[in-house]
């Protein structure tokens, strides 16, 4: 058993049929010695008396809010949550495996630039009695500070018969150094509590590996005189790190015909303009990636050719 | 470069960008194995990193690029020695068309651009981890290449910025 926060305790249980469970001793936080009784949740049933209560925690029915009383007055509370371990593996019932970039990916994180700011998100099908808390640091043995904001419900989607909820959090490294080479990874720890079930999820990454620029902005097409060719230009997204002579992007451009089956030629360039043949019903698209480190490509920015 | 002269920024820019491409060809798989789980924070601590105080940020380069260039050169020599060691020559076998060979040569080429003959900055001692098992060797290879990708990305930014803003 360990203390999650004041008056909230997590009991770690090996979860299998007829498991013996854990013996837990609760102590009433009071100078009083006599006439103390214990109850669980809203049930008025007295579970025991005395300053301490010893219980065998085996299942969710044994978890909940234990209260010690004297003379009808509550003296202190202890909330017991269960953390299940099945076959040596902690349960992951609350969050959905996003399976990208690999199996057992429960938390996904992205950064738009090298400022030390990043967003993480996760998915669940649970809609009620659910709370999350997030902690983050750089490195684990000698952690450096990362400050995370409040967790928000950022999207709801219908997936077949189920509703899926996406939660997200924004974090900022306290003293980021955008130009340096990261040596220690960022660690993100999410505690999830659903009713009386406790689970924790972690992710470890370098900012450089989760970079995904915003799409290029200000796409413009300028037809060239007496030619089927068009001069296309675009700009770095506003959210990208500066100066651009240092934090450079590379671009992938393509002209896509109306039919999805039509062959599209992709051209890679470090410039912010190009000359292409842009037919009437086609569209021109461009995406960006860090020029020197192969992290994610941005989403496409597109403009019709006509 | 030693003694305060300027490097051939444009040449360094070209070669460092080529290094980035080669480093990713040699080990393209991001997240293919979570290498940090194996041995965690200490494993690549002995490789040189370009850190916050090394003057490799745009402001630091403007003030005095020498500190940063010295740091980059130390790292290039370190990695060049590693890529020539039996970590990369032993099993699992690398084919002669492996980008590692070109990477090795390009690291040497860029370090020489930063230090013409006759000048000798002190370089740090190169560790010689020589694992005997193919599995350990392969894991170390992957770690070195992932770490090199990050190092040459910073070096390439430095030279791109230098070529754009510091060239005479």
């Amino acid at each position: 058993i360990w203390e999650l926060k004041k008056d909230v305790y997590v009991v770690e249980l090996d979860w299998y049929p007829d498991a013996p469970g854990e013996m837990v001793v609760l102590t009433c936080d009071t100078p009083e010695e006599d006439g103390i009784t214990w109850t669980l949740d809203q049930s008025g049933e007295v579970l025991g008396s005395g300053k301490t209560l010893t219980i065998q925690v085996k299942e969710f029915g044994d978890a909940g809010q234990y209260t010690c009383h004297k003379g009808g007055e509550a003296l202190s509370h202890s909330l017991l949550l269960l953390h299940k371990k099945e076959d040596g593996i902690w349960s992951t019932d609350v969050l959905k495996d996003q399976k990208e970039p690999k199996n057992k990916t429960f938390l996904r994180c992205e950064a738009k630039n090298y400022s030390g700011r990043f967003t993480c998100w996760w998915l669940t099908t649970i809609s009620t009695d659910l709370t999350f808390s997030v902690k983050s640091s750089r490195g684990s043995s000698n952690p450096q500070g990362v400050t995370c904001g409040a967790v928000t419900l950022s999207a709801e989607r219908v997936r077949g018969d189920n509703k899926e909820y996406e939660y997200s959090v924004e974090c900022q490294e306290d003293s980021a150094c955008p130009a340096a080479e990261e040596r220690l990874p960022i660690e993100v720890m999410v505690d999830a509590i659903h009713k009386l079930k406790y689970e924790n999820y972690t992710s470890s990454f370098f900012i450089r590996d989760i970079i995904k620029p915003d799409p290029p902005k200000n796409l413009q097409l300028k037809p060239l005189k007496n030619s089927r060719q068009v001069e296309v230009s675009w700009e770095y997204p506003d959210t990208w790190s500066t100066p651009h002579s240092y934090f450079s992007l590379t671009f992938c451009i393509q002209v896509q015909g109306k039919s999805k089956r039509e062959k599209k030629d992709r051209i890679f360039t470090d410039k912010t303009s190009a000359t292409v043949i842009c037919r009437k019903n086609a569209s021109f698209s461009v995406q960006a990636q860090d020029r020197y480190y192969s992290s994610s490509w941005s989403e496409w920015a597109s403009v019709p050719c006509s | 470069v030693p003694g305060g002269s300027s490097p051939a920024w444009a040449q360094c820019q070209q070669l460092s960008q080529k290094l980035c491409t080669l480093a990713w060809s040699a080990h393209p798989l991001v997240g293919h194995m979570d290498l940090r789980e194996e041995g965690d924070e200490e494993t690549t601590n002995d490789v040189p990193h370009i850190q916050c105080g090394d003057g490799c940020d745009p402001q630091g380069l403007r003030d005095n690029s020498q500190f940063c260039l010295q740091r980059i050169r130390q790292g290039l020599i370190f990695y060049e020695k590693l890529l020539g060691s039996d970590i990369f020559t032993g099993e699992p076998s690398l084919l002669p068309d492996s980008p590692v060979g070109q990477l090795h040569a390009s690291l040497l080429g860029l370090s020489q651009l930063l230090q013409p003959e006759g000048h000798h900055w002190e370089t740090q001692q190169i560790p010689s981890p020589s694992p005997s098992q193919p599995w350990q060797r392969l894991l170390l290879r992957f770690k070195i290449l992932r770490s090199l990708q990050a190092f040459v990305a910073v070096a390439a930014r430095v030279f791109a910025h230098g070529a754009a803003t510091l060239s005479p």
Epitope: - | L94, S98, P134
Partner: antibody, heavy 120, light 107 residues
Framework: QVQLVQSGAEVKKPGSSVKVSCKAS????????IHWVRQAPGQGLEWMGY????????KYNENFKGKVTLTADKSTSTAYMELSSLRSEDTAVYYC?????????????WGQGTLVTVSS | DIQMTQSPSSLSASVGDRVTITCKAS??????VAWYQQKPGKVPKLLLF???TRHTGVPDRFSGSGSGTDFTLTISSLQPEDLADYYC?????????FGQGTKLEIK
């Protein structure tokens, strides 16, 4: 896109030689090793060796030394595999293949195979 | 030379079955193992490399595991088009060697 096109099937007499070609396109010929793999009828795969066109250096599986000669013609982007002193047990499909760009020998692209039949 | 011993040499399974093929190397090859599928009369096709990394376009019902000397190819839910011979291949040490193959038949 990368393509490896091999020469057609051959029927040869025991004791003679055969030269199988593998014409490459879609990549820089001198940048990649070209490997040869044999598959006898109803049997598994056997790696024979490779040629590196950049410096014309071959590497052979010891089991095929003296039996096989690997060469390359940079001007036509073609690799050749010559088998000498043919015997009936050399009857097989011979494939050329090129590995991944990262320098390890897993084979991504294969030629269509050339059946060499040795029969008197 | 490193021997790659593949088992079973043939197996018959029904559509939807989970199928496992194993390969044992005669000495440590780290994870330098690839798996190929060869359909009747066709050229071998790369499925996995580094023991577990799926090649582009390979369905995710194919997965691999193992390191050192013991390797496994698993097809989680057999499809009719999976009828083929399967080969493991070590590329750790010269000469590169293949397993003798597993013939997979659909019941």
């Amino acid at each position: 896109q990368v393509q490896l096109v091999q020469s057609g099937a051959e029927v040869k007499k025991p004791g003679s030689s055969v030269k199988v070609s593998c014409k490459a396109s879609g990549f820089t010929f001198t940048d990649q090793t070209i490997h040869w793999v044999r598959q006898a009828p109803g049997q598994g795969l056997e790696w024979m060796g490779y040629i590196y066109p950049r410096d014309d250096s071959p590497k052979y599986n010891e089991n095929f030394k003296g039996k096989v000669t690997l060469t390359a013609d940079k001007s036509t982007s073609t690799a050749y595999m010559e088998l000498s002193s043919l015997r009936s047990e050399d009857t097989a499909v011979y494939y050329c293949a090129i590995p991944d760009r990262s320098g390890y020998a897993w084979f991504i692209y294969w030629g269509q195979g050339t059946l060499v039949t040795v029969s008197s | 030379d490193i021997q790659m011993t593949q088992s079973p040499s043939s197996l018959s399974a029904s559509v939807g079955d989970r199928v496992t093929i194993t390969c044992k190397a005669s000495r440590d090859v780290a994870i330098a193992v690839a798996w190929y599928q060869q359909k009747p009369g066709k050229v071998p096709k790369l499925l996995l490399f580094w023991a577990s990394t799926r090649h582009t376009g390979v369905p995710d019902r194919f997965s691999g595991s193992g390191s050192g000397t013991d390797f496994t190819l698993t097809i989680s839910s057999l499809q009719p088009e999976d009828l083929a011979d399967y080969y493991c291949h070590q590329y750790s040490s010269y000469p590169f060697t293949f397993g003798q193959g597993t013939k997979l038949e659909i019941k």
